[in-house]
């Protein structure tokens, strides 16, 4: 069989190398950059995706801060250290021995320091606010239809249980999607809200991580919903620790 006939690819992560060398000749896929085996029946962790992305870096993401405790991903891309489960390690360092602490979505939550910097635990991002602006349409979308479609999207495309979609707000043309998932709520096997938000962000930017699944086809009552900008705010279970100098 040719590779195309065997179709040994990872549907949920195009940034992988796959070969039929798993048990019984089954297709096994490893993330680029790390070589970690990934489960292609669900989303790959953002840490492994960022590590893979460093092999072909693109424009860094720049987000804005909605309030005093919300974090923004304004450091852009970096080559992260991931633990054996694919999660971000609490402490990240660059090649010049500059270190900092990150949250569960890999966003810096402390000032930068040196190798003596301690990050005692990986602090969970438990609340994500996705702020979207959609392109002009003939009229406003029906709020309940929009709510249902976005919940469906997160369940069907990103495999995120609807209970983690806390709310969908709409004031044309702005849509806000609130994702909430405390440490106590997330069971083994549940998709992480951070991973779902990252896949969604890449989808709306036209950089889908899915292999051959096509781009995001978002419709509300048959009317295409096209996103023209996205801002994502992250709130952690423990507020970040930045010096006053950074806040002024």
């Amino acid at each position: 069989h040719t590779a195309a006939q065997d179709n040994c690819t990872c549907p949920t992560n195009k940034m992988t190398v796959c070969s039929p060398d798993g048990p019984g000749g089954r297709c096994q896929c490893r993330a680029l950059g790390s070589g970690v085996a990934v489960d292609c029946s669900t989303l790959t962790s953002e840490c492994l995706l960022l590590k893979a992305r460093m092999s072909a870096p693109k424009n860094a993401r720049t987000l804005v801060r909605p309030n005093e405790h919300a974090l923004v991903d304004n450091d852009g891309l970096y080559d992260p250290d991931c633990d054996p489960e694919g999660r971000f390690k609490a402490r990240q360092c660059n090649q010049t021995s500059v270190c900092w602490c990150v949250n569960s979505v890999g966003v810096r939550r402390t000032d930068k320091g040196d190798l003596s910097l301690r990050c005692d635990e990986l602090v969970r991002t438990h609340h994500i606010l996705i702020d979207l602006r959609h392109r002009p349409t003939a009229g406003a979308f029906n709020h309940s239809d929009l709510d249902a479609e976005l919940r469906r999207l997160f369940r069907e495309r990103y495999r995120l249980h609807p209970k983690f979609v806390a709310a969908v707000h709409y004031e044309q043309p702005t849509i806000q999607i609130e994702l909430r998932q405390n440490t106590s709520q997330k069971a083994a096997g549940d998709v992480d809200i951070g991973d779902a938000a990252y896949y969604f962000e890449r989808d709306v930017k036209g950089e889908s991580l899915f292999q051959g699944r096509g781009g995001l086809d978002l419709r509300v009552r048959g009317e295409p919903l096209q996103v023209e900008r996205t801002l994502i705010y992250y709130l952690d279970e423990i507020p970040p620790k930045f010096s006053m100098k950074r806040l002024t």
Epitope: S41, L160, A187, A188, D190, V191, F210, G214
Partner: antibody, heavy 116, light 108 residues
Framework: QVQLQESGPGLVKPSGTLSLTCAVS?????????WSWVRQPPGKGLEWIGE???????DYNPSLKSRVIISVDKSKNQFSLKVRSVTAADTAVYYC?????????WGQGTLVTVSS | EIVLTQFPGTLSLSPGERATLSCRSS???????LAWYQQKPGQAPRLLIS???SRATGIPDRFSGSGSGTDFTLTISRLEPEDFAVYYC?????????FGQGTKVEIK
């Protein structure tokens, strides 16, 4: 490789309760997937009955909702179907399946006949 | 609920020929949520295509899917003897999940 296996009585009396179990092997039921039941009357098409998530959340076909209960047993890595007040119209091959961007894994199916 | 209508009901073709199967939806379905299955007598259905166009693992590249909105197509570029079976489309974008009534591809 995920495998699903249905089990349960092949014959149920009218007005009785149909009970089936689906054992999942080669993967955990506590995953991001939903787990479905689908049936197919002899010589006819496929009908989705309903599905369950590992936390017990369910979604049912409205046409069957009043008679159907789907439950999950994470400790045994299995989920179950109960259909009460059955009639001859419930005679079908019953399949369990994993719902993951379509039903990507299926059991082999079990024929349940409703007859006195 | 979303009703899926498949046509033709039966397709009589010879091995080596091209098969084109259609599925029409009563409401617009995002292409992200449409699947195709193959079922042979006495067997469970087998997922061929998800997301309207993404081939499932192990599915030969002679199978392809396309379409959007209310009209979707499954194409088998060159029929092999093992391809003669019943094919179902299914939408999983809204509850209840629904299937088309099926298209039987038989040997001419």
């Amino acid at each position: 490789q995920v495998q699903l296996q249905e089990s349960g009585p092949g014959l149920v009396k009218p007005s009785g309760t149909l009970s089936l179990t689906c054992a999942v092997s080669g993967g955990s039921i506590s995953s991001s997937n939903w787990w479905s039941w689908v049936r197919q009357p002899p010589g006819k098409g496929l009908e989705w009955i309903g599905e369950i998530y590992h936390d017990g959340s369910t979604d049912y076909n409205p046409s069957l909702k009043s008679r159907v209960i789907i439950s999950v047993d994470k400790s045994k890595n299995q989920f179950s179907l109960k259909v009460r007040s059955v009639t001859a119209a419930d005679t079908a091959v019953y399949y369990c399946a994993r719902d993951n961007w379509g039903f990507d894994y299926w059991g082999q199916g079990t024929l349940v006949t409703v007859s006195s | 609920e979303i009703v899926l209508t498949q046509f033709p009901g039966t397709l009589s073709l010879s091995p080596g020929e091209r098969a084109t199967l259609s599925c029409r939806s009563s409401q617009s379905v995002s292409s992200s949520y449409l699947a195709w299955y193959q079922q042979k007598p006495g067997q469970a259905p087998r997922l061929l295509i998800s997301g309207a166009s993404s081939r499932a693992t192990g599915i030969p590249d002679r199978f392809s899917g396309s379409g959007s909105g209310t009209d979707f197509t499954l194409t088998i570029s060159r029929l092999e003897p093992e391809d003669f079976a019943v094919y179902y489309c299914q939408q999983y974008g809204s509850s209840p999940r629904t299937f088309g009534q099926g298209t039987k591809v038989e040997i001419k």
